[in-house]
Structure formats: C-alpha cells, structure tokens
C-alpha cells in the first residue's frame, strides 16, 4: 500500500526533513506550510493548526515561500539619475539601474546604489573601451595617424585624412587640412562599424602627441575594472 | 601657465561674495577647473567643479548655496550665498590634470595662492 | 558615501628614515586616488596620482601604492624638505560625497 499523504502540521519521521514548501516549527515540533511570494506568516502553526497566511501590505514583499512575521520593505524611490527598471510589488523589491549614459558606481544586492555619468575623453584620446552598465569608458591617446577633436564618453581616434598637398599636418587632436579639395577617404581595415568612413594612416603627416600632463599612461588601463568617477550634470 | 584667485575679503554672515578665478596659458575649453577651500588650521575641503564641457559637481555640502561658472576664456567664478563663519576659509581655484585622456578626474595639478574670505559679524 | 581616513598626526621621521602614512576608503575606489603635500601658507602639491603614479618633477623618494579601500604614501630617505601637511584624495565620487579628501597626516622632520 502506498504511504499515506501526510497533511500539514504533522510531525516528521525521527531524522527526517520537511517537504518542499514546508518548514519545521521548533515550537511546534511540526512540519508547517510556507507562505508563498507575496505574503508572510500571520500566525504561526502549533500541534494542531497549520501557519496562516496573509498578504503582504503596500510598499512590501517577499519574493520567496517564507515564514516571515513580516513582510520586506521596498526600497527608496529610484533617484533621479536612475531608472526604474522593476516596479516595487507584493512579490519583488523595486529595481533601479542607471539611467543611459551613467553607469553603476556603487552597486548593491539587487540595482544600484549611487549611478556616475560616463566620463569623457578629451582632444587627442579617444575611447579605448566604451562604459557599460558597471564600468567606465577608458580613454587611450591617440597614435601617430590617428585624432580625436571632441571632448565624447563615444568617440574613437580616428585617422587623419591623405592629402595630395598637405596644408596643416594633423595631431592627436586635430585632423590633416589638405590644400586640395578632395582628400582621400578609404576604410581602415576592420572599421566598417564605424558610423562614418576613415582613412587609412596618412604618410604625408606628421603628427604630434596629444596634450597630457599625465607622463604616462600607467593610469589608462589598470588590471582589473577601469577605475570610475562620479559626476552629475549640473544646475 | 597659471591661477590665480581673487575676490576674498570680510564679509559678514548672510552676504552673497563671488570669488574670480582666472587662468594664464590654459584653455578652459580643454581642462577643468575646481574650487577647493582650507579653513583657517584645517584640513582640504573639495567644493566642487566645472568641466571642459561646461558640466558642474558639487560636494553635498556645497549643492545649492555655491555655484561655478565660467564667466569668460580665461575666467572661472564661485558665487557663494547665505555664508557663515563656518565658510571663513582660504578658497582655492584649481586645474583638474585630466589624467588617463578624461575630460575631468577630480586630481588638481595646479593650484591658485587661495584668497581669503572672513566672514565675521 | 565616501570618506577617507588618514593615519593621525603628527607621524616623526628621523632625516634619511622612512615615513609611512595610510590613507583609507570606506568604499572601493579602485586606483582613484592621490596624494597632495602642503606646506603653510602655501597651496597643496601634487604628488601621486592613480594610488601609485609619480607626478612630473616630484622627487623619486615619494611612492604611492594601494589599490581598492587601503593605501599607502612612504617617503624613503626623509629630508627635512619633507616636513609638511600629507592628503590624500579619492577620485571616484564627486556629488553625494560631502568631501573628497582625506584629514591630513602632519609629518615632522627630526
């Protein structure tokens, strides 16, 4: 004959363990029910009467089967250089992520604790690894042949165009100006995602390091996360 | 390549004092400038700062009652309001180094003397 | 938010000795971090930058090292030159932070 099912509370076999969905109640010495997502133990169970559950109140929750006497509290509204991303319900907390083009600074178990702006890079670097969601954007200068002219948390060193009669040589920061008025554009190898077209390395230029009053580059690209910084637009 | 603060005197609480911060031989298009303050036998306080890109940040502190801007090419300034004596301090303009290629990594390289601001009844 | 804590002052060196000062995060900073020297009546110097890059012109018996909450700033070969004001600075948060530097750590030259 099959065992017969044994319904909650009831007192489990000397070393034995609770069901799934069921805990055991040292008062009670009892296998209990569990409460599902969304509420929490009211009263809890004795000898003879199972828990009783109840919903959890506005602005709480619990995302688990649970004996909580409580429910969890939501966390704080997101701030204003958040998003949010998960709404606070009876059965999850609220979820806040950093809004586009801001990254995670300071994380916390589930979200962000405190969001940072994309820094930028300056005339003469260019983006050598673009921010995500939990880093920064790395700066890296630009190499001989290449320039950036903008001050982006997106652009790359691109290189500098091939004049037939070169007027001004490029730099890192500045591009050729060629005394004709067509230069030649051709695509660098492997650069077909860029959103505008580049030309290969110019031979008739010859460009000077960008601006930095860092002697190296020790600081660029450090072992490990890039190393952030916290900035909010202004007032 | 210089800084230079002005603008520091003896006000008395609740005056509104804008302090100048003009530089030589820098771009501001290119570097950003900060405000730090030091009061009188104390410690380095970071107030704030302004971008290359024209972007301000404050220290909580500060949110609210100091404001920077950039008043011209060569000019940054720092308008402060309902000062106390607790904001008698040296005031000191700074250029951020830009390290790493950033537009701004809060590390100054190069500082003003300060000027003085007393605020006194 | 971020605050910083130094080691306290005054820290005694003995000229041609070694000083040691450290300088703590309450949260990572990764390498965000500096280190100014500051004489009276005269404004901060930067020293380090990135917890362990030597400034231009600062003397090599400067070095910086640390890297996440703890670092340090040691002086080998103390002259009396180097009798100052030590800060460090973290360089990872600008706004909910009420400061970004550190107390000070005094050093004194015997």
């Known amino acids: 004959l099959p065992a017969q099912v044994a319904f909650t509370p009831y007192a489990p076999e000397p070393g034995g363990t609770c069901r799934l969905r069921e805990y055991y109640d040292q008062t009670a010495q009892m296998c209990c029910s569990k409460c599902p997502p969304g509420q929490h133990a009211k009263v809890f169970c004795t000898k003879t009467s199972d828990t009783v559950c109840d919903s959890c109140e506005d602005s709480t929750y619990t995302q688990l089967w649970n004996w909580v006497p409580e429910c969890l509290s939501c966390g704080s509204r997101c701030s204003s250089d958040q998003v949010e991303t998960q709404a606070c319900t009876r059965e999850q907390n609220r979820i806040c992520t950093c809004r586009p083009g801001w990254y995670c600074a300071l994380s916390k178990q589930e979200g962000c604790r405190l969001c940072a702006q994309l820094r930028k890079c300056r005339p003469g670097f260019g983006v050598a690894r673009p921010g995500t969601e939990t880093s920064d954007v790395v700066c890296k200068p630009c190499a001989p042949g290449t320039f950036s002219n903008t001050t982006s948390s997106t652009d790359i060193c691109r290189p500098h165009q091939i004049c037939h009669v070169v007027a001004i040589p490029g730099n890192a920061s500045m591009d050729a100006v060629c005394t004709s008025t067509s230069p030649t554009r051709s695509m660098a190898p492997g650069a077909v995602h860029l959103p505008q077209p580049v030309s290969t390395r110019s031979q008739h230029t010859q460009p000077t390091p960008a601006p930095s009053t860092a002697p190296g580059t020790s600081f660029l690209l450090p072992v490990g996360p890039s190393p952030p910084a916290e900035g909010s637009t202004g007032d | 390549q210089s800084v230079e603060e002005s603008g520091g005197r003896l006000v008395t609480p609740g005056t509104p004092l804008t302090l100048t911060c003009t530089v030589s031989?820098?771009?501001?298009?290119?570097?950003?400038m900060g405000w730090v303050r030091q009061a009188p036998g104390k410690g380095l306080e970071y107030i704030g700062f302004?971008?290359?890109?024209?972007?301000t940040y404050y220290a909580n502190w500060a949110k609210g009652r100091f404001t920077i801007s950039k008043t011209s090419s060569t000019t940054v300034d720092l308008k402060m309001t309902s000062l106390t004596t607790e904001d008698t301090a040296t005031y000191f303009c700074a250029r951020d180094g830009g390290y790493g290629g950033y537009d701004y990594t809060g590390i100054f390289n190069l500082w003003g003397q300060g000027t003085l601001v007393t605020v006194s009844s | 938010d971020i605050v910083m804590t130094q080691t306290a002052s005054p820290v005694s060196a003995a000229v041609g000795g070694t000083v040691t000062i450290k300088c703590q995060a309450t949260e990572s900073i990764s390498s965000w971090l500096a280190w100014y020297q500051q004489k009276p009546g005269q404004p901060p110097k930067l020293l380090i930058y990135?917890?362990?890059t030597l400034e231009s012109g600062v003397p090599s018996r400067f070095s910086g090292s640390g890297s996440g909450t703890e670092f340090t700033l040691t002086i080998s070969g103390v002259q009396c030159d180097d009798a100052a004001t030590y800060y460090c600075?973290?360089?990872?948060?600008?706004?909910?932070?009420?400061?970004?530097f550190g107390g000070g750590t005094e050093v004194v030259v015997k």
């Open positions: 600075q973290q360089g990872y948060i600008y706004t909910n932070v009420d400061n970004t």
């Open positions: 031989g820098i771009d501001l298009s290119s570097y950003t």
């Open positions: 990135g917890a362990s």
């Open positions: 302004i971008s290359s890109s024209g972007h």
